[in-house]
Amino acid sequence: SPQNPGCPNAEDKNFPRTVMVNLNIRNRNTNSKRASDYYNRSSSPWNLHRNEDPERYPSVIWEAKCRHLGCVDADGNVDYHMNSVPIQQEILVLRREPRHCTNSFRLEKMLVSVGCTCVTPIVRHVA
Amino acid sequence: SPQNPGCPNAEDKNFPRTVMVNLNIRNRNTNSKRASDYYNRSSSPWNLHRNEDPERYPSVIWEAKCRHLGCVDADGNVDYHMNSVPIQQEILVLRREPRHCTNSFRLEKMLVSVGCTCVTPIVRHVA
């Protein structure tokens, strides 16, 4: 439950559009060891690509790209009866406002691929 | 390349710790139709759970929980020779500072499960 039950939610229409944000991240080291090897051990393995943009915070975001169109079976062969697909998530990033070296940012939505999963294809019946 | 090549990166130590942020989201509707049915069609299917916190922005985040320990095979049976595991991602959220109805926020890191993937288990040989 909210600490301040009478406060407007930040998503409310009447909430101020500009707020102060402290960049000292809380939980900075929470689970920072999460670089697991799932990307290699998955039946829908993926590669990780570095997406860097100095005008954005965070400036580095890692994006997943599925290695295969199909999925890897128990023998290590690619089975095209199944498909590797990216799991995507919308995240919020801070985009520097386009005035020279300003300390003003704007929230921006980004769709990132986090990893891949193996799905049964949609079977389309042609009439 | 950056618009302002001489500007300090927002991750630099000498960057101001408090910045102004405009909450009018850019790319608000980017790919907003992405609610795919992968969670059902995956060999490592998952359920989506709503995580709500009015002191956070965004206040609602959906978290994935893998349905099975194993993975679903072509016949729809759970195969325990493989494991369903959550794909996790660190995201940034805004946490309202604990002063009554303040317009001050702090960046907070959250580890969220976005979906699940099917992996070969690590076999540990006991000496």
Epitope: H49, C66, R67, L69, V85, P121, R124 | -
Partner: nanobody, 125 residues
Framework: EVQLVESGGRLVQAGGSLRLPCAAS????????MGWFRQAPGKEREFVAA????????AYADFVRGRFTISRDDARNTVYLHMTSLKPEDTAVYYC??????????????????WGQGTQVTVSS
């Protein structure tokens, strides 16, 4: 938005080879699988080949497997279809296609949102 421009199509003798480049402009090129389709006169457009986002894997229609190879060069924003052992039945307009969604199939035409104008390949006997 992605613009696709195919080139490299021409008249070639049976048994010959061709390489068709497809140049893409737009930021989404590297984000999703790309595909090649073809349409012969009086026939429906059909899947030829597709390549994964990472470029590590490709899938082919049975009728070109072993003869055609798809590849991508993300630095050049280009996808290639390398065609060998060409047959007269390979005569068609070849289209490059990009997808902006990925819904668990790679050979279904409707999954591809962006198309080039096509390049004509004619194989004479």
């Amino acid at each position: 938005e992605v613009q696709l421009v195919e080139s490299g199509g021409r008249l070639v003798q049976a048994g010959g080879s061709l390489r068709l480049p497809c140049a893409a402009s737009g930021r989404t090129f590297t984000s999703y699988p790309m595909g090649w389709f073809r349409q012969a006169p009086g026939k429906e457009r059909e899947f030829v080949a597709a390549i994964s986002m990472s470029g590590d894997d490709a899938a082919y229609a049975d009728f070109v497997r072993g003869r055609f190879t798809i590849s991508r060069d993300d630095a050049r924003n280009t996808v290639y279809l390398h065609m060998t052992s060409l047959k007269p039945e390979d005569t068609a307009v070849y289209y490059c296609a990009a997808r902006t969604s990925y819904d668990g199939t790679y050979d279904y035409i409707d999954d591809y949102s962006y198309w080039g104008q096509g390049t004509q390949v004619t194989v004479s006997s």
